[in-house]
Amino acid sequence: KSEMPQPVSIQDINHRVWVLQDQILIAVPRKDRVSPVTISLISCRHVETLEKDRGNPIYLGLNGLNLCLMCAKAGDQPTLQLKEKDIMDLYNQPEPVKSFLFYHSQSGRNSTFESVAFPGWFIAVSSEGGCPLILTQELGKANTTDFGLTMLF
């Protein structure tokens, strides 16, 4: 089991990358002047206490920025948020911190990220682009939930 976060770059099937804008992650087309964030991911060390068949439970952080992705309810709806958090602090906790955990599932070159706290809700980007990352239950419709990961370094 890795004990260091793995830096990755993420883009969707429409070649849009994740960019940090006013503390919000948005998906934009890759261009010369766009500087995508590097995502850090690390597997939960309590994997034996989480469901085995949904993917690899991981924490997702923004490399070097002390920000992590988490899911929280806003009214009735789970929302995707960035919280100031050291990914290693999450990793070392005595129990899985479910609000910050995602099941990473890979099929060929495509990856999905399903919220552990809200099963059935996936990280997604609107098909229009230039929009914030969201959580959705609607797979393969107006939102893209399939992403490509490239390991860095």
């Epitope: 034996e48 206490t49 906790q93 129990e95």
Partner: antibody
Amino acid sequence: EVQLQQSGAELVEPGASVKLSCTASGFNIKDTYINWVKQRPEQGLEWIGRIDPANGYTRYAPKFQGKATITSDTSSNTAYLQLSSLTSEDAAVYSCSTLNYYGSSFFFDFWGQGTTLTVSS
Amino acid sequence: QAVVTQESALTTSPGETVTLTCRSSTGAVTTSNYANWVQEKPDHLFTGLIGGTNNRAPGVPARFSGSLIGDKAALTITGAQTEDEAIYFCALWYSNHWVFGGGTKLTVL
């Protein structure tokens, strides 16, 4: 209001089994970890184990493996502690507690009122 | 299994500062033990006070603080009040299970 309501006192014969309950109100047990602890007079607290009601996975203290079984029923928002092959050593007050993450830490935050188990023939 | 040791009893006066400690049989207590402190009042009324060594639970008065002092976890009550008379338990995390201490009976008179 968040509450953990535990079942009433039990008087059980040696060698038998008992199942204690802990019913939550004011929150969904799937959103927390439910822990069980044992307390005997003048002996402090002993952590027995915990369950994640969202998936049923459990952890136990080494001492209680084989003695205790923790289960949950999300439809009734209840966690259970079953103790088997009871002896006088198992006579104690058993309490349930939630373990929740706030901000940057886990806390044993909400507690049941305890269930007294007496083992006697 | 590790043994967690606390002072069996301490006495303080209202307004005074008192520190309770929590020692591990396996060596120095560190932040990786995620020390928790829990208060017990009569009739098995428990309240979680501190988690992760030094973080106060929501709603817990600021006079309660957690820290590491030397090789032990510590709970300090700054300006003790009569209602703080209780038994205080620490719990330490050891890789995959918690171990509670025997408790400290704090008398405030």
